[in-house]
Every structure is written in structure tokens, then in C-alpha cells.
């Protein structure tokens, strides 16, 4: 008997949907695996007899249910296969969306960018799927515990009157509000500002 | 492409170091923050040390302070993590994450796949 694939789990980020397992304990030797999705009531191979135990369904559609699985093999016999559901747009994490940063004087200017979603156009991203697509920032005085939110109505933000000559740091995530779901934060880009550029009385 | 390859994961006695080193390579313009994580499987991923390119300035997360040095190496775009006095509860894949700029002014997450590193005792 052949047991099935184990820890069967979706890994989606930003819609790059792969479907990940772990090869069982097996002593008659290498097992090989086949993974298939439903379309239209028949599952069809989508990685057939791979020695991989990951699967790329980045090319199902982004919305309704699907049901995958896999299953183990050695030789002419096979495990029971392993099912799972999953919805793209409901399941996929929201990954970290891009920023740039430009320091002028006592200001920080930033603007964020969408994740890119892979497998789509150059220019299609998270936010042409969601509607509600906004973002949180936060940023702080470097070395300082105290961190301070901001939700900017648009695709830029400008912080002004910062101490000068300190580094301020700053990340981005993607929200949706109607869903209540929040994207993974950025890694921090940190800038110093440089002179206040008001001249005194 | 921009990648993030970590190494100097593996196995060792409670008590004793390691150091885990993460290289970037491809066509970057510059680095302005790299960090170090770990995640147990089952668990929330968790922020260990971060570390401001430029400068060198570094923050930890207080369940490392004093244990672990995020350090790095500017002509090698590489960033290290020295773990010392290492226990079991410190076993974990450990990830390291960047914010990278392929063109000027425009930032981007990178994270690598994972080390291992395990501390029996």
C-alpha cells in the first residue's frame, strides 16, 4: 500500500498559487506524485508523475472554489488522494507592496506601488483585483519603540515637519477594508532627513 | 532578478554558535534595510534583527538581545547573523528579507527561501 502525500498545504502569495506536500516515509523506494484540479466535474493532471512535491496552479482563475489533489505512486500502485479547496481570491496572501521614497529637506515622499501579480500583464496587480485596495503605513524615529499609523487616501504620502538629520523608517502593507484582510508588511526603507528648510524671523 | 540566498544553517549542541550568513545578488542599485526572521512550523513568523544599510544601525527583537549580532559586509551585499549561546527553543528555519532598489528611489521586499537550523540539547 502506498501512503499518500502529507502536510498537503496551498502556498499563494499574490496569486502564485503552488500546492506544496511532503513525500511519505516509503521503503521500496522513490515515490513519484500526481497533482490534478476539477474543471467542469473531471479533474485534470496538472503535474503528472513528478518527483517534486510542489505543483504550480498559478493559471486557475482568481475566483470560486477549487478543488485540487494529489496523490503518491510507486510503480502500478498508488495512494488515495489527498483533496483540498481552495478560492485565490479569498485565500491568497497579499504580499508586500513596492515604495518609493525621496527625501527633501525636513519631508519624507513616498509613493506605493501594488504588488505585481505574476502571470498577467506588466502592468496588472493586486489592486486591479480588489476594489477596496488601500494601504497602511507606519513609520518611526529610528531607534524609537513608538510607531506611528497612517491610512493615506491615495497612492502617495507626504510626512512633513520631521526632525532633521534623523532617520525615519517606513513600511507599507496592503489592506481591504470590506474584507477586513491585511497584506504583509514591507521591509522597512529608512531615510535620513536632512536640513529644515524654514528660514527664522 | 534579485535573490536572497542564506547559509550556515545546521545542526548544533545547546550552548553553542552558529553563524548564518545572507548574500544578495542580481542587478540591485541599492539595499536600505535587511532583517533576519524565523518561523516554526505552526507559528507566526518572528522578527530577530534588522539591520539600516547605509549607517549599520541595527535594532533586536528582545528575545535575542545580547545573543545574536546582525552585522554586514557592503562590498559583498551580504548581511550576517552570529548566534551565540544558542538553546532548543531557538530552532527554526531562519529567513532573511530585504528592501532592495533594482532602479533608483524604488524599493521592493525580498525574502530568501529559509535555512534550518536546529539545537538539540
Known amino acids: 500500500m502506498v501512503p499518500p502525500p502529507e502536510n498537503v498545504r496551498m502556498n499563494s502569495v499574490n496569486f502564485k498559487n503552488i500546492l506544496q506536500w511532503e513525500s511519505p516515509a516509503f521503503a521500496k523506494g522513490n515515490l513519484t506524485f500526481t497533482a490534478q484540479y476539477l474543471s467542469y466535474r473531471i479533474f485534470q493532471d496538472k503535474c503528472m508523475n513528478t518527483t517534486l512535491t510542489e505543483c504550480d496552479f498559478s493559471s486557475l482563475s482568481k475566483y470560486g472554489d477549487h478543488t485540487l489533489r494529489v496523490r503518491a505512486e510507486f510503480a502500478d500502485e498508488h495512494s488515495d488522494w489527498v483533496n483540498i479547496t481552495f478560492c485565490p481570491v479569498d485565500d491568497t496572501i497579499i504580499g508586500p507592496p513596492g515604495m518609493q521614497v525621496e527625501v527633501l529637506a525636513d519631508s519624507l515622499h513616498m509613493r506605493f506601488l501594488a504588488p505585481k501579480i505574476e502571470n498577467e500583464y506588466e502592468t496588472w496587480t493586486m489592486k486591479n483585483v480588489y476594489n477596496s485596495w488601500t494601504y497602511n503605513v507606519q513609520y518611526w524615529k529610528n531607534g524609537t519603540d513608538e510607531k506611528f499609523q497612517i491610512t493615506p487616501q491615495y497612492d502617495f504620502e507626504v510626512l512633513r515637519n520631521l526632525e532633521p538629520w534623523t532617520t525615519y523608517c517606513v513600511q507599507v502593507r496592503g489592506f481591504l477594508p470590506d474584507r477586513n484582510k491585511a497584506g504583509e508588511w514591507s521591509e522597512p526603507v529608512c531615510e535620513q532627513t536632512t536640513h529644515d528648510e524654514t528660514v527664522p524671523s | 532578478e534579485v535573490q536572497l540566498v542564506e547559509s550556515g544553517g545546521g545542526l548544533v549542541q545547546a550552548g553553542g554558535s552558529l553563524r548564518l550568513s545572507c548574500a544578495a545578488s542580481?542587478?540591485?542599485?541599492?539595499?536600505?534595510?535587511m532583517a533576519w526572521y524565523r518561523q516554526v512550523p505552526g507559528k507566526q513568523r518572528e522578527w530577530l534583527a534588522r539591520i539600516i544599510w547605509s549607517s549599520g544601525a541595527t535594532n533586536y527583537a528582545d528575545s535575542v538581545k545580547g545573543r545574536f549580532t546582525i552585522s554586514r559586509d557592503n562590498t559583498k551585499n551580504t548581511m550576517y547573523l552570529q548566534m551565540d549561546r544558542l538553546t532548543p527553543e531557538d530552532t527554526a528555519a531562519y529567513l532573511c528579507s530585504g528592501a532592495i532598489s533594482q532602479t533608483r528611489g524604488t524599493f521592493w521586499t525580498y525574502k530568501s527561501q529559509g535555512t534550518q537550523v536546529t539545537v538539540s540539547s
Open positions: 542580481g542587478s540591485f542599485s541599492s539595499i536600505s534595510t
